[in-house]
Interface confidence: low
């Protein structure tokens, strides 16, 4: 009679996390008499998964009735599979012995791989804002997936990015894996409304990739441009000077007026006008009593934006010799002439 063979027909089985895995095993003979056991791994450190003879194995059920006469099918089903269950499973036949059963023959093994979905990608941007034309980095992380093969793409407003670096860890075999990618994005003035997207494709997602997003509005700072102009006034002894603060982001802005270097008024921008590109405009004005000045007045509009170093624009309000002599007899001879910024 031919010697008993232990047949594990599948070299590998792949199941999704949470499902049941069926591991098939068949014997070619009823002889020798003795139990079968299932192990994960080989050698001294192998883990007992199922013992036909004794023990409690709540997640394991046998596919057929093992006590049935002439049964040669020793397949098992393991419920609620997790990535930690991955490994090679061996069906082992033991020969009845005294005092202990003796290992007789092992199957070739079935490798169980577990398909686990990646977690939703988390995209994070730079800790500090940067100005247009600078490069900022965004990171994308996802964890807990298996198998290791995974595809990650970056997009900015629907356009694919190519300046990125992706690593999948660990490098060797593991029950599950993590992916970490860093993309470099060059900011432009129009990026307040822009978005970066990290897209992950994996076999478990069945063609429906996971996406994580980040808004460039959190990463960009668009510094303002300043323009100081004089508005026409009916009163001869007054000059109305405005400071137009344009195209800045984010909102936080404080403006200070100085007359000849002395603080005249400080205000915080409140009612802003939003531009189509997401940046803001704001205007402040200063009423100057020209008759109070015997000499030229240097007016400075100083703006501190988003905690950055102040920028300013200065203009000289020229008082003519005639005005200087006649004090309050100030006419329209007052003129606004630009000076170099302070």
């Amino acid at each position: 009679e031919d010697e008993l063979q232990v047949i594990q027909p599948e070299k590998s089985v792949s199941v999704a996390a949470g499902e049941s895995a069926t591991l098939r095993c068949a014997m070619t003979s009823l002889i020798p008499v003795g139990p079968i056991m299932w192990f994960r791994g080989a050698g001294a450190g192998r883990e007992l998964i199922y013992n036909q003879k004794e023990g409690h194995f709540p997640r394991v059920t046998t596919v057929s009735e093992l006590t049935k006469r002439n049964n040669l099918d020793f397949s098992i089903s393991i419920s609620n599979i997790t990535p930690a269950d991955a490994g090679t499973y061996y069906c082992v036949k033991f020969r009845k012995g005294s005092p202990d059963d003796v290992e007789f023959k092992s199957g070739a093994g079935t490798e169980l791989s577990v398909r686990a979905k990646p977690s939703a990608p988390v995209v994070s941007g730079p800790a500090v804002r940067a100005t247009p034309e600078h490069t900022v980095s965004f990171t994308c992380e996802s964890h807990g997936f298996s198998p290791r093969d995974i595809t990650l793409k970056w997009f900015k407003n629907g356009n694919e990015l190519s300046d990125f670096q992706t690593n999948v860890d660990p490098a060797g075999d593991s029950v599950s894996y993590s992916i970490h990618s860093t993309a470099r994005v060059v900011l432009t003035r129009g990026d307040v409304h822009s978005q970066v997207i990290c897209e992950i494709a994996h076999i478990t997602l069945q063609g429906d990739p996971l996406r994580g997003t980040a808004n460039l509005s959190e990463a960009i700072r668009v510094p303002p441009t300043l323009e100081v102009t004089q508005q026409p006034m009916r009163a001869e002894n007054q000059a109305n000077v405005t400071c137009q603060v344009s195209n800045f982001y984010p909102r936080g802005l404080q403006l200070t007026w100085l007359e000849n270097g002395n603080v005249s008024r400080t205000e915080t921008a409140s009612t802003l006008i939003e531009n189509k590109d997401g940046t803001y405009n704001w205007m402040s004005w200063l009423l100057v009593n020209t008759c109070a000045h015997r000499d030229d007045v240097v007016l400075t509009c100083q703006v501190e934006h988003d905690g950055q170093q102040a920028v300013s624009k200065s203009y000289a309000l020229e008082i003519s010799a005639h005005q200087k002599e006649h004090g309050s007899d100030i006419t329209h001879e007052a003129a606004l002439a630009p000076t170099a910024p302070l």
């Epitope: 093969d149 595809t151 793409k153 190519s162 990125f164 670096q165 063609g207």
Partner: antibody, heavy 117, light 107 residues
Framework: DVQLQESGPGLVKPSQSLSLTCTVT?????????WHWIRHFPGNILEWMGY???????NYNPSLKSRISITHDTSKNHFFLRLNSVTAEDTATYYC??????????WGQGTLVTVSA | DIVMTQSPATLSVTPGDRVSLSCRAS??????LHWYHQKSHESPRLLIK???QSISGIPSRFSAGGSGSDFTLTINSVEPEDVGVYYC?????????FGGGTKLEIK
């Protein structure tokens, strides 16, 4: 413009190690991307061998894992291939390349390595 | 490993012809398929990435499509400098693998 140039011995004896250098100009390898080695066998067979990332993490083709090592020297803007225990089957044109994602954007001109006694 | 199969092995065409090259993956690779062109004694050059995305500097006569496991590269009007070997590459799963190439010849 990014350019890559392979260099190393054109003849290696069986059982010895094959060592090649890729010199990169026009881009600092410490700034980003993956840096790959790919070989071209006679008969139009291209094989991806492995890469090293800008940060020094390497990843290899499982078929070569026991024999291959890819390292870099960011100060010189070089990265290296070492393939141990070569046989005649390792005779090929070896290319270094810069990866854009899972593709190869820039390639070196290639260097022919013959394994023969 | 994912096996990439290209057909035909050789293609002989006349300048001005419209030609299609086929690439098949042994399993679904979504759209993670890239095309290269290698002229004699030159390095491969990236033509198309992610199945259909054009690369700057590549003539517009090159286009491509497909997803899953079947992909096609089309040359709208072949020119003499298009001779060489065309390779497809799996960019979906490591190890990245290449097809065996399609050699384009001019009659």
């Amino acid at each position: 413009d990014v350019q890559l140039q392979e260099s190393g011995p054109g003849l290696v004896k069986p059982s010895q190690s094959l060592s090649l250098t890729c010199t990169v100009t026009g881009f600092s390898i410490s700034r980003g991307y993956d840096w790959h080695w790919i070989r071209h066998f006679p008969g139009n067979i291209l094989e991806w061998m492995g890469y090293i990332t800008y940060s020094g993490i390497s990843n290899y083709n499982p078929s070569l894992k026991s024999r291959i090592s890819i390292t870099h020297d960011t100060s010189k803007n070089h990265f290296f291939l070492r393939l141990n225990s070569v046989t005649a089957e390792d005779t090929a044109t070896y290319y270094c390349a810069r990866g854009g994602g899972a593709w190869f954007t820039y390639w070196g001109q290639g260097t022919l390595v013959t394994v023969s006694a | 490993d994912i096996v990439m199969t290209q057909s035909p092995a050789t293609l002989s065409v006349t300048p001005g012809d419209r030609v299609s090259l086929s690439c098949r993956a042994s399993q679904s690779i979504s759209d993670s398929l890239h095309w290269y062109h290698q002229k004699s004694h030159e390095s491969p050059r990236l033509l198309i990435k992610y199945a259909s995305q054009s690369i700057s500097g590549i003539p517009s006569r090159f286009s491509a499509g497909g997803s899953g496991s079947d992909f096609t590269l089309t040359i709208n009007s072949v020119e003499p400098e298009d001779v060489g070997v065309y390779y497809c590459q799996n960019g979906h799963s490591l190890p990245w693998t290449f097809g065996g190439g399609t050699k384009l010849e001019i009659k």
